[in-house]
């Protein structure tokens, strides 16, 4: 048993059908001695007597919020939350696994640049009862700050017969900077409480692994003269990291016909502007990834060609 | 990425060309390395991330755009000195932390140099002849080497007599080669930073 | 005490279906994930699928993907394997079992697919 | 579909040490904890070892479990004529608590 915060704590259980489970001696925090007796969550029941309760935690059913009292006044409250131990391993109920990149990919994070900031967001079909708290460091032996704000219901979305709820938190690395070279990856913990289940989750990264830069701005065409060409110029991002010559971005420029089905025409280039063929009714798109570390491509920034 | 390769104009700065070659190589390198020792502890959250040039060059800080050098949190160590001279300044003023920058850069070269040259030394002796460097990567630090043209001490390659543990070096290959390709991406950025300027 | 009783083998042609049970008794049934396992005549054990104690996940070995469901009813204490377009391959002593570091078995049942 | 392998027997006299190994890999016996069963014909595996060296109450403790690595064994000190049956070991692949891996099981013979 350990404590998540003041009088809130959880049970360890090895996770199997007839499990002898835990025993919990819970301390009424009182200098009274006498005439203190315990009950369990709403019910009058009185569960046992004195200034320590000695209770065989062995399911959900046993946890709660305790409580001792003394003649009709609260003394004290304990809350006891369960982790479940499947065969070795944590329990994942809360948390949906989202595959990608891959299997038990439960936290995503990303980031706009290298400044040290980054977002991280999770998803859930639990819709009340939740509670996520967010922990951050960059390394774990010695660990140097990272400050999370608080998690907030980012988007709902509708998936078959489910509703699924989707987490986001912001953190920023203390004293980040743009240049270094990480050795030591970035440490993400989330605790996650529903009703009585606690379950933690963990994501470990480097930034330079989890960029994904903004569409290129400013999107624009310039037809040529007497040809079917236009010049597509563009911006970098204002979320990417400066100076941009040091930063450099490399671009994907793709001409796209209505048709999904139509031959994309595709040009990489590293610089802001690129010459293509704009067929009637295509359009042009354009999107960002660092030059130098292939991290993921930023979304696409598109205009028509009419 | 395939990506269709720009060939430098002729007054490009010198050593950019060379550092573009040097990223691709390694990055080329890790990746067979990956593949090739799939059953071994290769990718990246996998090892340790070793800096066999700490304490030893300092790159990233002499070499430091000058736009972040008002960021506290990239000023951490700045007391390195480099010899000054190398074609890579060529025909222009520069300020003595440019020559200190690339002076850095060379060293790096050179340190990486005698390790994987011991390394694939031990390589070769492998029974399994399972991976051995690629001759290309080890051809483009040579030359961007020469291109920065630091006249430096020469290191001696590292000899050893004790029979290879070739499990471990697999594995060290595999840490050198993840941090060099982190300080190709430094260098590649410090070339283009130097030519916009 | 903890308690699994299969029923629902027999033999069937190839192609055909067959539904097996699990009923649990002894413990909360809907508080824990199920396997079945099964094992071939003279073979070894092999994992078939997996179901969360809630039945919001459901994992599938390779060789029965597309042809196996694996369900529950947690009102009635009971897990199910729904086997379709049976082949000779899928001849064997089918067991479900508890999920846990204690895990508790079924008798098994057998299973035979033949014409 | 076996990932773990094991030897397919092995033999012993009474009162001898008998081991088991099972081979597996770093996506399921390094991140995962082991387990062995013991299975007498004609009836379901009966658990050995959990956590790979845990032994559940009722069995005798001349059986022991351990794990190094990529793979696991099982020992029986004093091996006894009730001992002869196939033993497997288990673990989950890649974390993914849905998916067991079993060895190819292992028949333990006791001469004499």
């Known amino acids: 048993i350990w404590e998540l915060k003041k009088d809130v704590y959880v049970v360890e259980l090895d996770w199997y059908p007839d499990a002898p489970g835990e025993m919990v001696v819970l301390t009424c925090d009182t200098p009274e001695e006498d005439g203190i007796t315990w009950t369990l969550d709403q019910s009058s029941e009185v569960l046992g007597s004195g200034k320590t309760l000695t209770i065989q935690v062995k399911e959900f059913g046993d946890a709660g919020q305790y409580t001792c009292h003394k003649g009709g006044e609260v003394l004290s409250h304990s809350l006891l939350l369960l982790h479940k131990k499947e065969d070795g391993i944590w329990s994942t109920d809360i948390l949906k696994d989202q595959k990608e990149p891959k299997n038990k990919t439960f936290l995503r994070c990303e980031a706009k640049n290298y400044s040290g900031r980054f977002t991280c967001w999770w998803l859930t079909t639990i819709s009340t009862d939740l509670t996520f708290s967010v922990k951050s460091s960059r390394g774990s032996s010695d660990p140097q700050g990272v400050t999370c704000g608080a998690a907030t219901l980012s988007a709902e979305r509708v998936r078959g017969d489910n509703k699924e709820y989707e987490y986001s938190v912001e953190c920023q690395e203390d004293s980040a900077c743009p240049a270094a070279e990480e050795s030591l990856p970035i440490e993400v913990m989330v605790d996650a409480v529903h009703k009585l289940k606690y379950e933690n989750y963990t994501s470990s990264f480097f930034i330079r692994d989890i960029i994904k830069p903004d569409p290129p701005k400013n999107l624009q065409l310039k037809p040529l003269k007497n040809s079917r060409q236009v010049e597509v110029s563009w911006e970098y991002p204002d979320t990417w990291s400066t100076p941009h010559s040091y930063f450099s971005l490399t671009f994907c420029v793709q001409v796209q016909g209505k048709s999904k089905r139509e031959k994309k025409d595709r040009v990489f280039t590293d610089k802001t502007s690129a010459t293509v063929i704009c067929r009637k009714n295509a359009s042009i798109s354009v999107r960002a990834q660092d030059r130098y570390y292939s991290s993921s491509w930023s979304e696409w920034a598109s205009v028509p060609c009419s | 990425r395939n990506l269709p390769v720009a060939t430098p104009d002729p007054g490009m700065f010198p050593c950019l060309h060379h550092s573009q070659n040097l990223l691709r190589a390694v990055s080329n390198m890790l990746q067979k390395a990956r593949q090739t020792l799939e059953f071994y502890p290769c990718t990246s959250e996998e090892i340790d991330h070793e800096d066999i040039t700490k304490d030893k060059t300092s790159t990233v800080e002499a070499c430091l755009p000058l736009e972040l050098t008002k960021n506290e949190s990239c000023l951490n160590s700045r007391e390195t000195s480099f010899i000054t001279n190398g074609s890579c300044l060529a025909s222009r003023k520069t300020s003595f932390m440019m020559a200190l920058c690339l002076s850095s850069i060379y060293e790096d070269l050179k340190m990486y140099q005698v390790e994987f040259k011991t390394m694939n030394a031990k390589l070769l002796m492998d029974p399994k002849r399972q991976i051995f460097l690629d001759q290309n990567m080890l051809a483009v630090i040579d030359e961007l080497m020469q291109a920065l043209n630091f006249n430096s001490e020469t290191v001696p390659q590292k000899s050893s007599l004790e029979e290879p543990d070739f499990y471990k070096t697999k594995i060290k290959l595999c840490i050198l080669l993840h941090a060099f390709r982190i300080r190709a991406v430094t260098i590649d950025r410090v070339m283009s930073y130097l030519n916009a300027s | 005490q903890v308690q699994l009783v299969q029923s629902g083998g027999g033999v069937v042609q190839p192609g055909r279906s067959l539904r097996l049970s699990c009923a649990a008794s002894?413990?909360?049934?809907?508080?824990?994930?199920m396997h079945w396992v099964r094992q071939a005549p003279g073979k070894g054990l092999e994992w078939v699928a997996f179901?969360?104690?809630?039945?919001?996940?459901?994992y599938y070995a390779d060789s029965v993907k597309g042809r196996f469901t694996i369900s529950r009813d947690n009102s009635k204490n009971t897990l199910y394997l729904q086997m379709k377009s049976l082949r000779a391959e899928d001849t064997a002593v089918y067991y479900c079992?508890?999920?846990?570091?204690?895990?508790?078995w079924g008798q098994g049942t057998m299973v035979t697919v033949s014409s | 579909s076996y990932v773990l392998t094991q030897p397919p027997s092995v033999s012993g006299t009474p009162g001898q040490r008998v081991t088991i190994s099972c081979s597996g890999g770093?996506?399921?016996?390094?991140?995962?904890?082991v387990k062995w069963y013991q299975q007498l014909p004609g009836t379901a595996p009966k658990l050995l070892i959990y956590?790979?060296?845990q032994r559940p109450s009722g069995v005798p403790d001349r059986f022991s479990g351990s794990k190094s690595g990529t793979s696991a064994s099982l020992a029986i000190t004093g091996v006894q004529a009730e001992d002869e049956a196939d033993y497997y070991c288990?673990?989950?692949?890649?974390?993914?608590?849905?998916?067991?891996?079993f060895g190819t099981g292992t028949k333990v013979t006791v001469l004499g």
């Open positions: 002894g413990f909360t049934f809907s508080s824990y994930g």
């Open positions: 179901i969360r104690y809630d039945g919001s996940n459901k």
């Open positions: 288990q673990s989950y692949d890649r974390g993914f608590t849905g998916s067991r891996v």
């Open positions: 956590g790979n060296d």
């Open positions: 079992t508890t999920h846990g570091s204690h895990d508790n």
């Open positions: 770093r996506s399921n016996i390094v991140s995962n904890t």
